[in-house]
Interface confidence: low
């Protein structure tokens, strides 16, 4: 906490500019008017303040807005955002996607901090659902964002938003999350033709049930082994040798290299040896 001291004569700040970097902490506290700071927040980022000086500026804003900053200030926080605690951010009401983008830009390149997680939570809850524009923005900054959500949170994602999802956005999703996302993807892409549909749905297939895999096996999709290895074991087990052969197409030879790994290992153990022999891969059930 900075002590309250009178501002020395001639040092009262008329505007937020580079001269302030030479002010001691107590001078900033005494000589910078909080209302002036709030209206000229956009200038702060262009000035190389020390972290200690930024602490003082934050303190002034906290005093001016004890109930939480207005969005006009939040949008221009810049590096001052890194000084905010999750408790500070919980007081905010962020409704503009531009504000969200501006603050995410500050944290760009780092793993999602508790501050960013709180900010996103406030923003998404304020909107009521993860709309496409928001999802586009969040996955651009944090490819793993979607997979950091609980299945319950994912259930609020409208199918239309699934169009914004890229394969790499699903890399860290676990099966429970894909179980929620897959039906949404199926709905979102339902009007596409066979080959285009498969390209889009492929990343979500870790949540697909047996019946959908059987259907895909009838469509000459040539699923690669990497995708097959991510399928639910319980969805793969009921597939026949013929269905797996059709599903994988020319990639079926890859089963040999994966014969000790799930779900291939478990699937092999469920098949009749005569059926496995038809593949000519030397798989032993």
């Amino acid at each position: 906490e900075v002590e309250k001291t009178a501002c020395p004569s001639g040092k009262k700040a008329r505007e937020i500019d580079e001269s302030l970097i030479f002010y001691k902490k107590w001078e900033l506290e005494a000589c910078v008017d909080a209302a002036l700071l709030a209206t000229q927040m956009d200038r702060v980022n262009a000035i190389p303040f020390t972290y200690e000086q930024l602490d003082v500026l934050k303190h002034k804003l906290d005093e001016l807005y004890p109930q939480g900053y207005p969005e006009s200030v939040i949008q221009h926080l810049g590096y001052l955002f890194l000084k905010m605690s999750p408790e500070d951010i919980r007081k905010w009401n962020v409704t503009s996607l531009e504000t969200l983008k501006a603050l995410l830009e500050v944290n760009k390149g780092h793993e999602m901090s508790p501050q960013v997680a709180t900010l996103i939570d406030r923003f998404v809850k304020g909107r009521g659902q993860l709309d496409k524009d928001t999802l586009d923005t969040l996955t651009a900054f944090y490819p793993g964002y979607l997979c950091s959500l609980s299945p319950e949170e994912l259930s609020s994602v409208p199918p239309s938003s699934i169009w914004a999802v890229r394969p790499q956005d699903l890399d860290t999703c676990d099966p429970r999350q894909l179980d929620v996302l897959y039906p949404k993807a199926r709905l979102a892409f339902q009007n596409m033709n066979g080959s285009e549909y498969f390209v889009k749905i492929q990343s979500f297939l870790g949540g697909a049930p047996t019946e959908d895999l059987k259907a895909l096996s009838q469509q000459n999709v040539s699923m690669d082994l990497a995708t097959f290895m991510k399928l639910r074991t319980d969805a793969v087990l009921p597939l026949t040798v013929a269905e797996v052969q059709k599903l994988l197409g020319p990639h079926v030879e890859g089963l040999k290299a994966e014969e000790r790994h799930r779900p291939v290992r478990d699937w092999i153990l469920r098949q009749r040896q005569d059926d496995l022999d038809t593949l000519g891969l030397g798989l032993q059930g």
Epitope: A117, P143, S148, L149, S150, E153, T172, D174, R176
Partner: nanobody
Framework: EVQLAESGGGSVQAGGSLRLSCAAS????????MGWFRQAPGKEREGVAA????????VYSDSVGGRFTISRDNTKNMVYLQMNNLEPEDTAMYYC??????????????????WGQGTQVTVSS
């Protein structure tokens, strides 16, 4: 019942290497994110590295990036942490964790439901 057993800790000089192992059982290993965490004396437990079940999207903490490598073998239900160029600051008890709670980042200490007993790593200068 979920069980995690760490091994491979020990004492080493600064600049040396160690390879930690974590043997997992009692759950579907191949479908779960695995994490390595550490706790130095008098400090809070912190995330070191985590690897999703797909082995893509691996994350490291800033303090170990470039020196430590996390890997997994889904056929053996094992996760490993190769630690090179060790520093005295790496001295800590190292823990393996699994069953990541949805909605948490992969290096969040509060993000995992199951933990091993830990293995001690001591780096002297």
């Amino acid at each position: 019942e979920v069980q995690l057993a760490e091994s491979g800790g020990g004492s080493v000089q600064a600049g040396g290497s160690l390879r930690l192992s974590c043997a997992a059982s009692g759950f579907t290993f191949s479908r779960n994110t695995m994490g390595w965490f550490r706790q130095a004396p008098g400090k809070e437990r912190e995330g070191v590295a985590a690897i999703p079940y797909t082995s893509t999207g691996i994350v490291y903490s800033d303090s170990v990036g470039g020196r430590f490598t996390i890997s997994r073998d889904n056929t053996k239900n094992m996760v490993y942490l190769q630690m090179n160029n060790l520093e005295p600051e790496d001295t800590a008890m190292y823990y393996c964790a699994t069953d990541r709670r949805p909605g948490t980042t992969m290096l969040a200490v509060n993000g995992y439901n199951h933990w091993g007993q830990g293995t001690q790593v001591t780096v002297s200068s």
